[in-house]
Structures are given as C-alpha cells and as structure tokens.
C-alpha cells in the first residue's frame, strides 16, 4: 500500500493562473497511489462541483483535471485538488485570477530596435521589447531588394522572415546576427502581433568595412609590417 503522490509535479509548478476573461482554464493534479486514489476539488475551501457556474465545469478523473470554459471574474479564487486513498491524502492549491483589462494591440518600446552600426565580422544584437495582454507572436523581418526594387507592385516592401517566436508578455526578444557582412546591412523590422492586431518598428543596420590594420592609429605599426 502507498499513500497518494504526485506523478508529474513539474506540470504543477505554475501555481498562479492569470487569464483573460472568456478563456478556458485547466488545472491538473496527476497522482497515483495504492489503492488508486480519488480526486475532488475545492474552491476557496468549499466543495466545488460547478453547479452555480454558467457553463458548469468538466471533471476528468482519469486525467486528474478540472476544466472551466469561458471564465468570468466570479471564477477568481483558490482551487484545491484533494487526492486521497485509505493510506493518506495530499493537496495542492492553484490561484486563479481573471483579467478584465481591455486587450490591446502589442505595444513596442520606443527606440527599439535601435539603429546600429557594426564592423564586418562582428556580432550584432537587435532588441525588441513587447507589451501585450494577449499572448504575442513576433517576427523579425529584413527588408530586401528583388529585381532592383525594394517594393512590390502593391506598394508594400519586400521582406524576408528571419525569425518567428511566440513569447510571453513583456519579454525582450533578441535577433542575433553573427559575423556580419556588408550584405547584412539594411532595414530590420520587429513585428509583434496578437489576436487584436499587429504593431511593428524598424531600425537600420550599417555595416562598416573591416578596419585596415595598416592605418589603425591605436595599433603599433611594427605589428603589421612584413
């Protein structure tokens, strides 16, 4: 015989769930024991069956889960999974916060990405800081020339996608350019999008030729002579 224990504690590390109103929330407390334990749920310390909740709840005992769809502010609270068998019991608390802020287009920090000058062969980092209520996705784009033109017949620029990423709100997204060459010079755009819309800002990368060691003032002349 064995008291209940968590089988996937790493899946339970996210204690605070802050989600926009209208989204679906799923709490899981995967467990095992001998005899096989049962699971029940409490909300703010009281037995929770979801009978007073519009849309009810879904309890999936085989998945050790509680699912609530279309959450509203009244769903805020502490949700406790209580797992027990004849030998013992364990519990875990989840905190649910329902966000009512108006989700907006992503906001990009002013001045990022910043115009940058680099020397051939050096490494460059372009930064983009995104603020977004809804989960944002980011693309780094390079403006390119096709058949001698920067713009298509529709009047919009030709762009090449360098990197795509889904990020958490308020993260800094970095585009790394290693060992830059003259061809890397040009306009780069950080484009952030969410379910409301897109926002984007651009910067120019200027790439200078490698410094000629024979005329670098700071270097001792003798080092570069044959």
């Amino acid at each position: 015989q064995q008291a209940p224990y968590w089988t996937h504690p790493q899946r339970m590390e996210k204690k605070l769930h802050a989600v926009p109103a209208g989204n679906t929330v799923k709490f899981r407390c995967p467990a095992a024991g001998n005899p096989t334990p049962t699971i029940r749920w409490l909300k703010d310390g009281q037995a929770f069956h979801g009978e007073n909740r519009i849309g009810g709840i879904r309890l999936r005992h085989q998945h050790w889960s509680l699912v609530m769809e279309s959450v509203v502010p009244s769903d805020r609270g502490t949700y406790t999974c209580l797992v027990e068998n004849a030998v013992g019991s364990i519990r875990y608390n989840y905190l649910l916060d329902v966000l009512e802020r108006s989700p907006h287009r992503p906001i990009l920090q002013a001045g990022l990405p910043a115009n940058t000058t680099a020397v051939v062969g050096s490494d460059v980092e372009l930064l983009c800081k995104v603020y977004s209520d809804a989960q944002p996705h980011i693309q780094w784009l390079k403006h390119i020339v096709i058949n001698g033109s920067s713009f298509g017949a529709d009047g919009f620029p030709y762009v090449q996608v360098l990197k795509t990423a889904d990020i958490n709100s308020s993260e800094v997204e970095v585009l790394y350019l290693r060992n830059v060459s003259a061809e890397d010079a040009g306009e780069y755009t950080c484009l952030a999008g969410n379910s409301i819309g897109l926002s984007y800002q651009s910067a120019w990368l200027t790439v200078l030729p490698e410094e000629d060691p024979t005329w670098t003032a700071a270097a001792p002349e003798a080092r570069y002579t044959d």
Epitope: R105, A134, H137, G152, D154, F156, L191, G193, S195, I196
Partner: antibody
Framework: EVQLLESGGGVVQPGRSLRLSCAAS????????MHWVRQAPGKGLEWVAV????????YYADSVKGRFTISRDNSKNTLSLQMNSLRVEDTAIYYC?????????????????WGQGTMVTVSS | DIVMTQTPLSLSVTPGQPASISCTSS???????????VYWYVQKSGQPPQLLIY???NRFSGVPDRFSGSGSRTDFTLKISRVEAEDVGVYYC?????????FGGGTKVEIK
C-alpha cells in the same frame, strides 16, 4: 478568391442554444485571428468575440461573456460560435470577419474581409 | 471601452457635391507604432460592411480616390469629394486598437 461563409442561423427560443459556423477559403486560415460581429435589425454594428490564429486566446464583449464561446478548427478552415442561454437581444445578423494575420501586412491587418452573415432570431 | 461618436446621423447630398462625416473617439487611437487605428466602412442595403479606409487615411484596394480619411488622435473625418449615386449607404467608423472593438453609430448617406 478570399471568402467567408456563415451558416447555422435560425429561429430559437430564449434560453436555448445555437451554434454558428463560418467556412473560410482562399487564404491561409490558420495564420489569421478571426472575429464575430453582429448587427441587430435596423441597428449598428457590435463586436462579439475574437480568437487568435491558434485558438489560444479568446476575448468577448461583456454582453455575451459566459454565454458565448468562440472556437476554431484549423484543419477544417472553420470558425464557430456556440451561443448558449440566448436572449431576445441576441437577435441579429452575425458576421464572420477576418482579423490580423501573422506576417507583414500588405494592407490592413485585418477587418478587411466579411462574410455575408447569418440571421439569428431569438423569440418566444 | 472606447466610445465612437459619429455625426451627422444622416446626410442628403446632391450628386457631384462633397460630403463629410465626422467621428470622435473617447480615447486617442494613436498607437505607439505611430499609426492611428481608425477604420471606415460603408454598408449598402442587404450587404455586409465594406472597408473603405484603414489606419486613418489609407484607401483599401479598389476604393475610388474620391474617398479620403483624415484626422488625428481623437477626431476623424471621412470625405467624399464628389458623391455618386452608388455611394448611398450607411457609413461607420471603427476603432481597431483594443478590445472590445467599437463602431460609431453610423451615418446614412442618401442622394437628393
């Protein structure tokens, strides 16, 4: 040709449910957020809900929060609106609207393509 | 929520004459990326709305150049330089900066 075609409207009693669908064609559906907008007879336009391109984010107007659920099936290029606990004031034409895409916008970033709409009448 | 207020409620215009519709938002629609997210639509009888102007002043593809949008931050204008018979319908402004997306109440344009 880019097209959105709504279906599922009809006459329903207050308190009952209805499920609307929107079939998308002519564009990469899975790369776009999608919206529902409604228009009561003889009235203006009211935004209802939005879902992100991958379905991970959903937002609703206060008037439908907790009663309506927006969802999508990218494998079938279909957007849905499950409407529960319907009220007389939900009577409207419901339009499916394309939202923002994932790439550099060659034009507006959404709200450019609307379906023809499907009529929902809630009446006892 | 951002409130969009449109004036006038209706407009009767002689063909060939100009027409102007105003829209005021309760908050600035100028975004951090420098764009102003106001859209203009026309809805003709029995049809869904059709996009005319996006991001304050950009004409949507296929929209005649007699339509123009202007304004800044909270005050916006849609102008039709020379009204034609086919321009009859209800015109709406919309803010596309945050949810809930909101529309003006509409301006009905008819021909004298």
């Amino acid at each position: 040709e880019v097209q959105l075609l709504e279906s599922g409207g009809g006459v329903v009693q207050p308190g009952r449910s209805l499920r609307l669908s929107c079939a998308a064609s002519g564009f990469t559906f899975s790369s776009y957020a999608m919206h529902w907008v409604r228009q009561a007879p003889g009235k203006g336009l009211e935004w209802v809900a939005v879902i992100s391109y991958d379905g991970s984010n959903k937002y609703y107007a206060d008037s439908v929060k907790g009663r309506f659920t927006i969802s999508r099936d990218n494998s079938k290029n279909t957007l849905s609106l499950q409407m529960n606990s319907l009220r007389v004031e939900d009577t409207a034409i419901y339009y499916c609207v394309r939202g923002a895409g994932r790439g550099y916008p060659h034009g507006p970033d959404g709200f450019d393509i609307w379906g023809q709409g499907t009529m929902v009448t809630v009446s006892s | 929520d951002i409130v969009m207020t449109q004036t006038p409620l209706s407009l009767s215009v002689t063909p060939g004459q100009p027409a102007s519709i105003s829209c005021t938002s309760s908050r600035s629609l100028l975004h951090s990326d420098g764009k102003t997210y106001v859209y203009w639509y026309v809805q003709k009888s029995g049809q869904p709305p059709q996009l005319l102007i996006y991001e304050l002043s950009n004409r949507f593809s296929g929209v005649p150049d007699r339509f123009s949008g202007s304004g800044s931050r909270t005050d916006f204008t849609l102008k039709i330089s020379r009204v034609e018979a086919e321009d009859v319908g209800v015109y709406y402004c919309m803010q596309y900066i945050e949810a809930p997306l909101t529309f003006g109440g509409g301006t009905k344009v008819e021909i004298k």
